[in-house]
Amino acid sequence: CDLPQTHSLGNRRALILLAQMGRISHFSCLKDRYDFGFPQEVFDGNQFQKAQAISAFHEMIQQTFNLFSTKDSSAAWDETLLDKFYIELFQQLNDLEACVTQEVGVEEIALMNEDSILAVRKYFQRITLYLMGKKYSPCAWEVVRAEIMRSFSFSTNLQKGLRRKD
């Protein structure tokens, strides 16, 4: 499956929206930095099959959607930007779902990509626990926003790589 160019553009738009969502100076949040242990190896295109990488992207976007759909998130961010962000994520989920089912049969996906999906879920679990521990403070959200931007950037680069391999 050739990931459509629109998906890459959507990813870029999502990144721009995330960048625009910032509300406070990043400089005041340095002490809240945290190692979430981004599962970089899951997205390593050389080590894993394309279908696995795509399903890991899918899980990451799904988890991002879940994270930013909470009431705590709604209170933290601008509603208009958040709505636009949801739309981008939803579109990307649709693109990736079509891609995954085209790569392998639906019934094989769950088994084949269980480890990578679990790694992504654990990563987001750490993010959620961090936010809870920080009582969803503005700085905690800033740190999480920066982290999600980094993981999105990473997956965007890998998607470019996957398209090139085709």
């Epitope: 960048a19 910032g22 100076s25 990043h26 400089f27 949040c29 340095l30 002490k31 809240d32 930095r33 945290y34 190692d35 979430f36 800033e142 740190v143 920066a146 982290e147 931007m149 980094r150 950037s153």
Partner: antibody
Amino acid sequence: EVQLVQSGAEVKKPGESLKISCKGSGYSFTSYWIGWVRQMPGKGLEWMGIIDPSDSDTRYSPSFQGQVTISADKSISTAYLQWSSLKASDTAMYYCARHPGLNWAPDFDYWGQGTLVTVSS
Amino acid sequence: DIQMTQSPSSLSASVGDRVTITCRASQSINRFLNWYQQKPGKAPKLLIYAASSLQSGVPSRFSGSGSGTDFTLTISSLQPEDFATYYCQQAIDLPFTFGQGTKVEIK
């Protein structure tokens, strides 16, 4: 390959203005902050200030506040350090270095080669 | 501002020696501490970040430890290329501040 390339050495007279540059390549320039560090001859490292190129938000060390201006042009992936009126005591090597911002990653992992500024009448 | 104090300011050692440099912060900085190596005429090089994480490409003879206010950089077996000046730097709050440096010289 990640690189920070600084502009060349400068020889200036007291009272003159100067703007030195630091061009980033091989990475997303707006995803990292750029810090500036001064090293006077035979002395240690002094942290001057930092800029977030994504929005040009800047912070200075109290020792350098009002003495220098840090800026960035994200369209050409370049950060700047400037003086409006140089003093002999500004003679030093100036380094730029990148910082991962709020992300958990190595701080100041890449440095420019340094720009030697000599101020003498 | 957070003050960073390194000790000793200089030391003489031989190849193969175990070398320890300490850094003390004027207030707790958790584990937000970096160590740099600088050779004459060169830009500083990051060795250790977050108190104990070894930067990619740095030999494993370098290690860092500590948290709160007291930190240590250890070179387990000094090599000829390790003769340089070492700086600690706090990274928890602006302005970031460096220690005054420790010069490691050949005995």
